[in-house]
């Protein structure tokens, strides 16, 4: 059985620039200890969106929405979107390590698509 | 109903050894992260040691790390906790916790008294 | 580690009236918008028992005169009104960083 589980419950958003995206997240355990981070892209090349622990993010909030007692949420939202910013957003859950951390599991993803803003 | 009942708790001399052992019913244990924690007049409550879900991993504070040692039998709904190289400090009464998400301590066991004394 | 202050270490309040807790983290215990600090009851000869998870969610079966609020490091635990049955002695405990670490209790008593 799964020690922990990730997950982003949307496949996919769209969200009309200039707009916030609101990307949800949900762990089912805080075991094993270690920072949860979002990233876009995967491998190599992604992109860190947001570390709570380390960085500025200017663009990024955490949202927790109306809390369930069997999961814990790990949402955020990203304001001023624009067209750059579409791509799949991966909520990764890393397990504490020494010297570094090490990726424990991700979510499936989730892809955001930019609308041009309504004129 | 939930349950968790403690045994294994006794007067031990310092130095010795005991093994705390918490029996689970009620609920999916096998889907739980399980806990001790202690409880002296002294010091109130002190989280003691935690084993994720599947028995992978475990956590323990400085006071008793690499002294004491949790592990779980899930097909046995039961925790232990290997305890050696007791000190008068670890006298206590020792609870049983379950954690469904690793955060709060949802319920716990009446508890069982650990007394190391010369 | 994250030492938390809980204040008063006792505390008389007549029946149907407000008691109040509160516990101080001497580092921010929230992540991504939860903050992991819980309250717990203990009566005499008990173990405890949870009454508020994650700062402000009401344990199921906990009536609802408990209340939880607080953010970053403050943390309040309201009890109003105050009945004969919650005399006991009250902890929060933060799990947002190991080791996780409780208050040193609040007794509560009827005046």
């Known amino acids: 059985e799964d020690e922990l589980q990730v997950i982003q419950p949307e496949k996919s958003v769209s969200v009309a620039a200039g707009e916030s995206a609101t990307l949800r997240c949900a762990m089912t355990s805080l075991i094993p200890v270690g920072p949860i981070m979002w990233f876009r892209g995967a491998g190599a090349g992604r992109e860190l969106i947001y570390n709570q622990k380390e960085g500025h993010f200017p663009r990024v909030t955490t949202v927790s929405e109306l809390t369930k007692r069997n999961n814990l949420d790990f949402s955020i939202s990203i304001s001023n979107i624009t067209p750059a910013d579409a791509g799949t957003y991966y909520c990764v859950k890393f397990r504490k390590g020494s010297p570094d951390d090490v990726e424990f599991k991700s979510g499936a993803g989730t892809e955001l698509s930019v609308r041009a803003k309504p004129s | 109903e939930v349950q968790l009942v403690e045994s294994g708790g006794g007067l031990v001399k310092p130095g010795g050894s005991l093994r705390l052992s918490c029996a689970a019913s009620?609920?999916?244990?096998?889907?739980?992260?399980m806990s001790w924690v202690r409880q002296t007049p002294g010091k109130g409550l002190e989280w003691v040691a935690t084993i994720s879900s599947g028995g992978t991993y475990t956590y323990y504070p400085d006071s008793v790390k690499g002294r004491f040692t949790l592990s779980r039998d899930n097909a046995k709904n039961s925790l232990y906790l290997q305890m050696n190289s007791l000190r008068a400090e670890d006298t206590a009464v020792y609870y049983c916790?379950?954690?469904?998400?690793?955060?709060?301590?949802?319920?716990w066991g009446q508890g069982t008294t650990v007394t190391v004394s010369s | 580690d994250i030492v938390i202050t809980q204040s008063p270490a006792s505390l008389a309040v007549s029946l149907g009236e407000r008691a109040t807790i509160s516990c101080r983290a001497s580092?921010?215990?929230?992540?991504?918008?939860?903050?992991?600090m819980h309250w717990y009851q203990q009566k005499p000869g008990q173990p405890p028992k949870l009454l508020i998870y994650r700062a402000s969610n009401l344990e199921s079966g906990v009536p609802d005169r408990f209340s939880g609020s607080g953010s970053r490091t403050d943390f309040t635990l309201t009890i109003n009104p105050l009945q004969a049955e919650d005399v006991a002695t009250y902890y929060c405990h933060q799990s947002a960083d190991l080791p996780w670490t409780f208050g040193g209790g609040t007794k509560v008593e009827i005046k």
């Open positions: 916790a379950s954690q469904l998400t690793g955060s709060e301590f949802d319920y």
């Open positions: 009620g609920f999916t244990f096998s889907s739980y992260v």
């Open positions: 580092e921010s215990v929230d992540s991504y918008g939860n903050s992991f």
